[in-house]
């Protein structure tokens, strides 16, 4: 049965868009006018995984790409990256665990948990331009909630 | 409480068409996926197939040339048929509910038809 | 398509722990599911998501699944918990059971 997706971008709290850095890295930083068309552009895949009432599994794939955001660990440190997939498979309802976010939504706000490494989040710095990452700390200096928005397909 | 209940001919030749019913009682239809299973006497579970209610299907490849699995969401049952039958398809066969809050597993099962395949 | 391996029985005396084991090439990156099954009935599931128990499994239950095996730990087996348990993963979007383990308790 074929997966369900929808294309969003993200934002994080700080209103800071996500953009490509290199061919394998997201960086997060805010973006004006024009320059909103860098911002990259998620299908965001339904997929297996724990399911309640605010929680909701999900695979970040790049639009048009067969990239996807996938947690591994990297020097034993659970680690965001891009990872390359064959599109003829992907995206597919039984997502692996690398890929696997769980959106956990409260007051309107979004995290995105990483299914592989519990409590670890996709997190983005206070500091302009730098790397999106996998952070294990909620609540402190690093931001771990976004926003999202629909894009017509 | 989610019920799910079975029925079809438990005795066939050789040749003949396996086709079986589940009913499905309690609970929302069109928000889940359902399942079907085998297990031959003495021996492990083996996955047919799936479906969920707009009649999309995902069938395991050693068995799709000759299972064909189907919805009717006005009764809340969906039904497996599987053709040219010989005696390695006599199974205990049910029919469960794959979930979306248990991971898209199997949680709720029917009571199994036991299906002999004999001449 | 993968396959996913069970010793066929495991035994264990009243109130100790039982482990169960399946193993299957990178089992630990896909979800693992444990089924029940006791003679004449249908499966129940007991473990899913790797370690997540169902309501009205008993808390005795637990799972764990990295690298290439997933584990179905009982602790304070009782004589009830006799049974065949099965794994369950997906490989291709086609779900793949164990063979099945025979727990005996002694």
């Known amino acids: 049965a074929p997966v369900r997706s929808l294309n969003c971008t993200l934002r994080d709290s700080q209103q800071k868009s996500l953009v490509m850095s290199g061919p394998y890295e997201l960086k997060a930083l805010h973006l004006q006018g024009q320059d909103m068309e860098q911002q990259v552009v998620f299908s965001m895949s339904f997929v297996q995984g724990e399911e309640s009432n605010d929680k909701i599994p999900v695979a970040l794939g790049l639009k048009e790409k067969n990239l996807y955001l996938s947690c591994v660990l990297k020097d034993d440190k659970p680690t965001l990256q891009l990872e390359s997939v064959d599109p003829k498979n992907y995206p597919k309802k039984k997502m692996e665990k690398r890929f696997v976010f769980n959106k956990i939504e409260i007051n309107n706000k979004l995290e995105f948990e990483s299914a592989q490494f519990p409590n670890w989040y996709i997190s983005t710095s206070q500091a302009e331009n730098m790397p999106v990452f996998l952070g294990g700390t909620k609540g402190g200096q690093d931001i771990t909630d976004f926003t999202m928005q629909f894009v017509s397909s | 409480q989610v019920q799910l209940q079975q029925w079809g001919a438990g005795l066939l030749k050789p040749s003949e068409t396996l086709s079986l019913t589940c009913a499905v009682y309690?609970?929302?239809?069109?928000?889940?996926?359902w399942s079907w299973i085998r297990q031959p006497p003495g021996k492990g579970l083996e996955w047919i197939g799936e479906?969920?209610?707009?009649?999309?299907?995902n069938y395991n490849p050693s068995l799709k040339s000759r299972v064909t699995i189907s919805v009717d969401t006005s009764k809340n049952q969906f039904s497996l048929k599987l053709s040219s039958v010989t005696a390695a398809d006599t199974a205990v066969y049910y029919c469960?509910?794959?979930?979306?809050?248990?991971?898209?597993?199997?949680?709720?099962w029917g009571q199994g038809t036991l299906v002999t395949v004999s001449s | 398509q993968s396959v996913l391996t069970q010793p066929p029985s495991v035994s264990v005396s009243p109130g100790q722990t039982a482990s169960i084991t399946c193993s299957g090439d990178?089992?630990?990156?896909?979800?693992a599911f444990w089924y029940q099954q006791k003679p004449g009935q249908s499966p129940v599931l007991v473990i899913y998501?790797?370690?997540k128990r169902p309501s009205g499994i008993p808390e005795r239950f637990s799972g764990s699944n990295s690298g290439n095996t997933a584990t179905l730990t009982i602790s304070g087996t009782q004589a009830l918990d006799e049974a065949d348990y099965y794994c369950?993963?997906?490989?291709?979007?086609?779900?793949?059971f164990g063979g099945g383990t025979k727990l005996t308790v002694l």
């Open positions: 469960a509910r794959a979930s979306p809050s248990s991971g898209w597993t199997l949680d709720y």
């Open positions: 309690g609970g929302s239809f069109s928000d889940y996926y």
């Open positions: 479906i969920d209610h707009s009649g999309s299907t």
């Open positions: 990178k089992l630990g990156d896909k979800f």
């Open positions: 998501l790797d370690n």
């Open positions: 369950q993963a997906w490989d291709s979007n086609i779900e793949v």
